[in-house]
Amino acid sequence: IPPHVQKSVNNDMMVTDNNGAVKFPQLCKFCDVRFSTCDNQKSCLSNCSITSICEKPQEVCVAVWRKNDENITLETVCHDPKLPYHDFILEDAASPKCIMKEKKKPGETFFMCSCSSDECNDNIIFSEEYNTSNPD
């Protein structure tokens, strides 16, 4: 930590890496919930024009794709992987790519992904081949 930067009283935003350097936050697409035309594709772009600096350095990018009888939506946000999102743990938060995984939600089809590189939730990937065999 730079010596002139005060240590936080409320320490949750003074995040450092293993070498003691200040951890900078990443950039994520951040459009909250928007209607989407992404359907039956191996991958989709978010079509979100808003890129934000995540509020906290530990946050990662998240995308949530939902389809019900009426519409399809895509949600893009930053979120702390230590906390559940839509009641699910972000298991893939360390991934550089946003690989969609289906979650069980009654009354809708629900996919979610998380990732930890700048704007990685702009390109959401549904293709099964990425889930198993693709190392990057």
Epitope: A21, V22, F24, L27, I53
Partner: nanobody, 122 residues
């Protein structure tokens, strides 16, 4: 030696404007990520804005979007933060920081200025 020196802070009324400057020396300006980061009294760091080079793409925290504008003048080796519609919650020490890639490891070397105090109060 890399040096970053902020200026332009001061006391301003709510709704007012300020422009912060960060004079850089000791490196080729305009080649790295530059940030404005602030720290309110007794709080942690808040990462306000980033400008990339090349290309000059700019990014903002949601809390300042539409009110703050980051820019750089490579000929003057200076980074700026134009702050409009200031609020009491913008009161903080504002630091400029430079992030320089450390080889191909994906890691960075960071350099920080000493900070300039912005107080928004009536």
């Amino acid at each position: 030696e890399v040096q970053l020196l902020e200026s332009g802070g001061g006391l301003v009324q709510p709704g007012g404007s300020l422009r912060l400057s960060c004079a850089a020396s000791g490196f080729t300006f305009g080649t790295d990520q530059m940030w404005w980061v602030r720290q309110a009294p007794g709080k942690g760091l808040e990462f306000v804005s980033r400008i990339d080079s090349p290309g000059g793409r700019t990014y903002y925290a949601n809390s300042v979007k539409g009110r703050f504008t980051i820019s750089r003048d490579n000929s003057k080796n200076t980074l700026y933060l134009q702050m409009n519609s200031l609020r009491a919650e913008d009161t903080a020490v504002y630091y400029c920081a430079k992030r320089q890639p450390a080889g191909v490891s994906g890691k960075y070397v960071d350099y920080w200025g000493q900070g300039t105090l912005v107080t928004v109060s009536s």
